[in-house]
Structure formats: structure tokens, C-alpha cells
């Protein structure tokens, strides 16, 4: 099938980084500056993305791949391919329509992005709070209250605090 197709369509022989130039008898011509083709057999090259304004270049455009952008410091990427930059907040805060606001009591955010999430409820796992939560950190759950009864000869070392799940980005 491939051989048949190439007999019918000479453009299928043009590799990535080139385009099939109709103005030159369908010769494979290199993509012009600031353009690329990531697949073979293309009749045009795509214009390279320009990382301007709040965006900065993470990866330069080449003849075979588009530029990749990220955000200037103080911002992080949102959307497919970093289509938008969202302002960072401090740990212990979340971004609202009115800007960065501190997490309400009983919630925390250990990142510069995302939302404040409730502290872990240790009692649901039959455990006690070993370290109190803050705006920036989840509580650390320790042994169950029964394990801490006066008759117990030794305290079992607490299990490591579970890594809080990342909030959906």
C-alpha cells in the first residue's frame, strides 16, 4: 500500500522538516525559518509558536517540532501545551477571584497552585493527631489512642505521613 501511495502522491516522500512544494513540481523543500513540519508528507509547514508576554521559551522551535513555552516566574502553566499562565500564590493560600487568600482553618495547601484541601481526619483511620495541621501542612496522624494507653510498654513508631494527593490542576 505504501508503495502504491508513493507512486500516486510524490508528497508522501517528503520527510518531517520539509513540505511538498506545489510551486516547484512537488519537490520537498525545507520549512522556511520560524516554521516546522512534525510529520512527513505535509503540503505546508506550520508557523512556530512564539513565547511572548508572560510566556518564555522552554524549547526552541526546530524544523521538525514546535516551540514549547512555560511561564515567567510567579506564574505556572494551565491548559494543554501551556496555553495560559496563572499567578502563583504562597503556600497556605489559594487563588480566588479576588486574588490569593489564606486557607480557611482546617484546610491547607502545600503548593503555590491549586486549592486548599481539608486536613486528614485521623479518627477515620482510628488514629490520633500526632502533629497539628497548619495552613501549609496536613496533620500527621499517629498511633491510635488505644496504643497510647498507660499500660502500653512502648509506643510503636508512627507510620510515615501519607503524601497528600495533588489537587487537580
Amino acid at each position: 500500500f505504501e508503495r502504491t501511495r508513493s507512486l500516486q502522491d510524490p508528497c508522501s516522500n517528503c520527510p518531517a522538516g520539509t513540505f511538498c512544494d506545489n510551486n516547484r513540481n512537488q519537490i520537498c523543500s525545507p520549512c522556511p525559518p520560524n516554521s516546522f513540519s512534525s510529520a512527513g508528507g505535509q503540503r505546508t509547514c506550520d508557523i512556530c509558536r512564539q513565547c511572548k508576554g508572560v510566556f518564555r521559551t522552554r524549547k526552541e522551535c526546530s524544523s521538525t517540532s514546535n516551540a514549547e513555552c512555560d511561564c515567567t516566574p510567579g506564574f505556572h502553566c494551565l491548559g494543554a501545551g501551556c496555553s495560559m499562565c496563572e499567578q502563583d500564590c504562597k503556600q497556605g493560600q489559594e487563588l480566588t477571584k479576588k486574588g490569593c487568600k489564606d486557607c480557611c482553618f482546617g484546610t491547607f495547601n502545600d503548593q503555590k497552585r491549586g486549592i486548599c484541601r481539608p486536613w486528614t481526619n485521623c479518627s477515620l483511620d482510628g488514629k490520633s493527631v500526632l502533629v497539628n495541621g497548619t495552613k501549609e501542612r496536613d496533620v500527621v496522624c499517629g498511633p491510635s489512642p488505644a496504643d497510647l494507653s498507660p499500660g502500653a510498654s512502648s509506643v510503636t513508631p508512627p507510620a510515615p505521613a501519607r503524601e497528600p494527593g495533588h489537587s487537580p490542576q
Epitope: K52, G53, V54, F55, F75, L78, S83, M84, C85, E86, Q87, L95, K97, K98, G99
Partner: nanobody
């Protein structure tokens, strides 16, 4: 043609003041948040301040809080950045931008000006 144009930059001594203006042509600033960014030589672009369209709420970077004031005059289609108590580290090219959403989100299709140079030196 839609564009933003900054003006009011210049050379000023430390402790001095400047007022930058951001003028829009081809569209009305009323419906846009307007942000100011700056870029010093060899450094990354830095967010400075922003004013919302809806209620004119103002937001500032910690580095300029208490020294800079952003305001808008919708009748004149202008946004101002008043800069007091200027320091040498405020030296940069200052850009205004009109994000399509709000003060906290900036996209590829936002309008940007060409920038105005502010130099703070004795």
C-alpha cells in the same frame, strides 16, 4: 488597529516619582483588567500590578506594595501606574497588558504594549 501604548518613562533619581500611562487604541479599556509587568536587563519579566475592570480592585507585587499605585480613567481610555520612592532596582522596561480574563490569568492572545524605559539612578 488594536494596540496598547505606554508612556511616562524616563530617568529619575532614587526616591523620586514617575507616572506611567497605558493608552488603548482600537478598543475600550473599560472591559479589560490591565496589568503592568517589568523586565530588567538580563532578568525575567516580572508582574508588578494589575487593576480589575469590574470594580477597579488593585493588586500589587510585594516588591512595590505601598510605593506604587495603579488607577484607571475609563473616560480617557487610560490606566496609570504612579511610582513613588523609586529605587535603583525598579530600573526596567515597563509593559502594560490587557488580559482577556482577569488579573491572575494571562494568555497568548492578550494585548501587550511595546514598553517604556524607567531608569532610577543618581
Amino acid at each position: 488597529q488594536v494596540q496598547l501604548q505606554e508612556s511616562g518613562g524616563g530617568l529619575v533619581q532614587p526616591g523620586g516619582s514617575l507616572r506611567l500611562s497605558c493608552a488603548a487604541s482600537g478598543f475600550s479599556l473599560d472591559y479589560y483588567a490591565i496589568g503592568w509587568f517589568r523586565q530588567a536587563p538580563g532578568k525575567e519579566r516580572e508582574w508588578v500590578s494589575c487593576i480589575m475592570s469590574s470594580d477597579s480592585s488593585a493588586y500589587y507585587a510585594d516588591s512595590v506594595k505601598g510605593r506604587f499605585t495603579i488607577s484607571r480613567d475609563n473616560a480617557k481610555n487610560l490606566v496609570y501606574l504612579r511610582m513613588n520612592s523609586l529605587k535603583p532596582e525598579d530600573t526596567a522596561v515597563y509593559y502594560c497588558t490587557a488580559p482577556r480574563s482577569d488579573c491572575f490569568h494571562y494568555g497568548e492572545n492578550d494585548y501587550w504594549g511595546q514598553g517604556t524605559q524607567v531608569t532610577v539612578s543618581s
